[in-house]
Interface confidence: medium
Amino acid sequence: AGTPPGKAFNLTWISTDFKTILEWQPKPTNYTYTVQISDRSRNWKYKCTGTTDTECDLTDEIVKDVNWTYEARVLSYPAGNVESTGSAGEPLYENSPEFTPYLETNLGQPTIQSFEQVGTKVNVTVEDERTLVRRNNTFLSLRDVFGKDLIYTLYYWKSSSSGKKTAKTNTNEFLIDVDKGENYCFSVQAVIPSRTVNRKSTDSPVECMGQEKGEFRE
């Protein structure tokens, strides 16, 4: 209640591994939306001009500096006239919450790249997800961006039982002890312990020994 017709509300940042979209409501009726995002010079940059959608991909802007705290706003204009303004000479607009990508982007579901058994040891490798953050024209991996802030937790258990064990690493590899002759299943989770929000990813798909990803050597 109390929101003027045409004014956006519920502005929400949806961000995973730095892919970042601003969403809002409602669907437009007789108006269009334009998004502005504040750059590092505190200038407002126009994005998604004259859109009838209720989301705007701001990834290209936020990856320029993932440690910066960004603000965005959604402007509403009468349909077919992006120059129209409200009674105070300004378009209706609503500000987003602040968003700091490094601290707030969700950690995407990790993937177990491979596991290799050598005797009673298993080496489990987590895929180093590529992000949309660039440096020197190269896309950085999650590990490149977060460094040792990012750890992985491995959950592993015998296929024949449900009792889980855990291991942690601040690289992308685990080396764990297993019982000879037993098959094990694995799942990993990405964690940034220093965060206060969005600390953990969802668990990876479960991979079990005896499947294609594994390798066994005496």
């Epitope: 209640a1 017709p5 519920n10 979209i21 409501q25 409602p26 669907k27 437009p28 009726t29 007789n30 108006y31 009838t52 959608d53 989301e55 349909a79 077919g80």
Partner: antibody, heavy 124, light 108 residues
């Protein structure tokens, strides 16, 4: 004449994942939103969520943690997955086209094409 | 969440009579988002009215919609035997999109 044909498993056990697909015949995914709606036995309609042809999604907050809607433009179809089902998820599930209809100066939104519905029962 | 409350729950009328169905919203709804659907047993809902007032393709002119803000009405000027069904209002602009609880129009 656009038609929606839907299919998927009709009987599930608690904790399993419901999976339904809806194929669009006689028209394109592009330019529309595509919704899933459900109706428990003897009750009213509940909107589950929607997806655009670009893959952008909106979900009902009451189900958001369990719902995934995806789109396959190459097959002209979209899908619903609902994880960790319970008996409360027993319902007829409908897919529908959510149309943004442009008129001079603005848009209307409504669901003008519906699938026939798939009955999903969750029982141990 | 915008809650849509439909009344009455059941309307018992005879063919040829006029039916007036009410849909009240918990918050103001832009009429562009407001639609009415008809559902018969074992069938999917069918769009009747969109934009609060506009009849969908193939819908007879005995169906009409009116209202604005928080109060909307579906009127069936003269009930035909095939009109006995459940009617739902819906708003499709603000997530979560919501339906009213339905009004059953039954033969008296």
């Amino acid at each position: 004449q656009v038609q929606l044909q839907q299919w998927g498993a009709g009987l599930l056990k608690p904790s399993e994942t419901l999976s339904l697909t809806c194929a669009v015949y006689g028209g394109s995914l592009s330019g529309y939103y595509w919704s899933w709606i459900r109706q428990p036995p003897g009750k009213g309609l509940e909107w589950i969520g929607e997806i655009g042809a670009s893959g952008s999604t909106r979900y009902n907050p009451s189900l958001k943690s369990r719902v995934t809607i995806s789109v396959d433009t190459s097959k002209n179809q979209f899908s619903l997955k609902l994880s960790s089902v319970t008996a409360a998820d027993t319902a007829v599930y409908y897919c529908a086209r959510d149309t943004p209809y442009y008129y001079e100066g603005g848009y209307y939104y409504y669901m003008d094409v519906w699938g026939k519905g798939t009955t999903v029962t969750v029982s141990s | 969440e915008i809650v849509l409350t439909q009344s009455p729950g059941t309307l018992s009328l005879s063919p040829g009579e006029r039916a007036t169905l009410s849909c009240r919203a918990s918050d103001s709804v832009d009429s562009s988002y407001l639609a009415w659907y008809q559902q018969k047993p074992g069938q999917a809902p069918r769009l009747l009215i969109y934009g609060a007032f506009s009849r969908a393709n193939g819908i007879p002119d005995r169906f009409s919609g009116s209202g604005s803000g928080t109060d909307f009405t579906l009127t069936i000027s003269r009930l035909e035997p095939e009109d006995f069904a459940v009617y739902y209002c819906q708003q499709a602009g603000v997530v979560p999109y919501t339906f009213g609880g339905g009004t059953k129009v039954e033969i008296k």
